[in-house]
Interface confidence: medium
């Protein structure tokens, strides 16, 4: 029988070199064996490229489209084929569907006496438009204290966050992760970075602890 697309391909771009398209088929499908997603930049002399999809669950497929780079006016035609059968035809403008890359190298510095300093890396090179447009959300939680989970919004450009160590409980471990979005490109949030763990050994000075104890 003929194959059918149940949920049309939806694509997001990292605005650098990869766009990811996901879709669902009408029944169990071996995506890499049975399907091909062809994509072509709408431009006078561009070539057609072929993406071999991977399975993403029983009926889901995902394809990673490689692009030399991305500029704001780019528009791609997309054709989903099953052998000689054209299942779906559409188009995709990367600049209108941006999901930033996840920040990397999240590091926690606890050697400053009363401050926990978190730093991470901007996932884009300086010549990319998103480089100076990213803002971040830092999620801090504790496995020892399930009630504790905070989101810190970092709306300045520098990929750092300072937290007074006194706002965290002493003697327990915390985890942090960070994600990004770009305001001017109306992007979705990136995936979370891998989390990093640290032990909060900070103890308030005796006077302050004594003061807290009596109030």
């Amino acid at each position: 029988g003929s194959m059918k697309v149940l949920q049309e391909p939806a694509c997001v771009s990292d605005y650098m070199s990869i766009s990811t398209c996901e879709w669902k088929m009408g029944g169990p499908t071996n995506c890499s064996a049975e399907l091909r997603l062809l994509y072509q930049l709408v431009f006078q002399s561009s070539e057609t490229h072929t993406c071999v999809p991977e399975n993403n669950g029983g009926v889901g497929c995902v394809c990673h489209l490689l692009m030399d780079d991305v500029v704001s006016m780019d528009n791609y035609t997309l054709d989903l084929w099953a052998g000689q059968q054209l299942l779906w035809k559409g188009s995709f403008k990367p600049s209108e569907h941006v999901k930033p890359r996840a920040p990397g190298n999240l590091t926690v510095h606890t050697n400053v006496s009363d401050t926990v300093l978190l730093t991470w890396s901007n996932p884009y090179p300086p010549d990319n438009y998103l480089y100076n447009d990213l803002t971040y959300a830092v999620n801090i939680w504790s496995e020892n204290d399930p009630a504790y989970s905070r989101i810190h919004n970092v709306t300045y450009l520098k990929p750092t966050l300072r937290i007074p160590a006194s706002t965290l409980k002493s003697g327990i471990s915390y985890r942090a992760r960070v994600r990004a979005w770009a305001q001017h490109y109306n992007t979705t949030w990136s995936e979370w970075s891998p989390s990093t763990k640290w032990y909060n050994s900070y103890r308030e000075p005796f006077e302050q602890r004594h003061h807290h104890h009596h109030h």
């Epitope: 930049l41 431009f43 006078q44 002399s45 561009s46 070539e47 030399d68 500029v71 006016m73 528009n75």
Partner: antibody, heavy 120, light 106 residues
Framework: DVQLQESGPGLVKPSQSLSLTCTVT?????????WNWIRQFPGNKLEWMGY???????SYNPSLKSRISITRDTSKNQFFLQLNSVTTDDTATYYC?????????????WGQGTTLTVSS | QIVLSQSPAILSASPGEKVTMTCRAT?????MHWYQQKPGSSPKPWIY???NLASGVPARFSGSGSGTSYSLTISRVEAEDTATYYC?????????FGAGTKLELK
């Protein structure tokens, strides 16, 4: 570092054929890009003449189509321009340039140009 | 073919001044490129796909536009910017260039 170098006769008589060579170093002409010929007339007007792509396909400016040919020698990493039945209007500086196909029509690499005079 | 008209033909500016030159196309184009050319040299890629600065181009340069109207702006002109600037399209064959805007310093 990609470099392009034009070479040619400098002076051609009217009605004769013009042959120019572009030697590319630092990049294989079969790897990527369109390899173009562009000329600049004495008044500085630039005109795209045509290209041969990395795959060997070619495209020409319709205004020159009847008398232009662009070919290549992949073993020498060179491409060539032949322009037939030249007139004094073909007097110009001739540039070879690489780019175009995947760069949304931008010419990334240019030779330094060779001046051609058509005169009897 | 798509004809590109650049204006002004000659632009005279004082150092530190902001200048804008325009390129108009007879039909809509998707990408517009700009080149800088100095006497005795070949054109250099300057702005790629409307607004992206080529490698090594100072940040005082910017490009914008869409459809049939594009522009190149220099926020604060410097002596080294003295050159002729050409726009170029490849939305249709033949690829075409504008006639150029010559930037001079007062």
């Amino acid at each position: 570092d990609v470099q392009l170098q034009e070479s040619g006769p400098g002076l051609v008589k009217p009605s004769q054929s013009l042959s120019l060579t572009c030697t590319v170093t630092g990049y294989s002409i079969t790897s990527d890009y369109a390899w173009n010929w562009i000329r600049q007339f004495p008044g500085n007007k630039l005109e795209w003449m045509g290209y041969i792509s990395y795959s060997g396909s070619s495209s020409y400016n319709p205004s020159l189509k009847s008398r232009i040919s662009i070919t290549r020698d992949t073993s020498k990493n060179q491409f060539f321009l032949q322009l037939n039945s030249v007139t004094t209007d073909d007097t110009a500086t001739y540039y070879c340039a690489g780019g175009g196909l995947r760069r949304r029509g931008l010419f990334d690499y240019w030779g330094q140009g060779t001046t051609l005079t058509v005169s009897s | 073919q798509i004809v590109l008209s650049q204006s002004p033909a000659i632009l005279s500016a004082s150092p530190g001044e902001k200048v804008t030159m325009t390129c108009r196309a007879t039909s809509s184009v998707t990408y517009m490129h700009w080149y800088q050319q100095k006497p005795g040299s070949s054109p250099k890629p300057w702005i790629y796909a409307t607004s992206n600065l080529a490698s090594g181009v100072p940040a005082r340069f910017s490009g914008s536009g869409s459809g049939t109207s594009y522009s190149l702006t220099i926020s604060r002109v410097e002596a080294e910017d003295t050159a002729t600037y050409y726009c170029q399209q490849w939305s249709s064959i033949p690829l075409t260039f504008g006639a150029g805007t010559k930037l001079e310093l007062k």
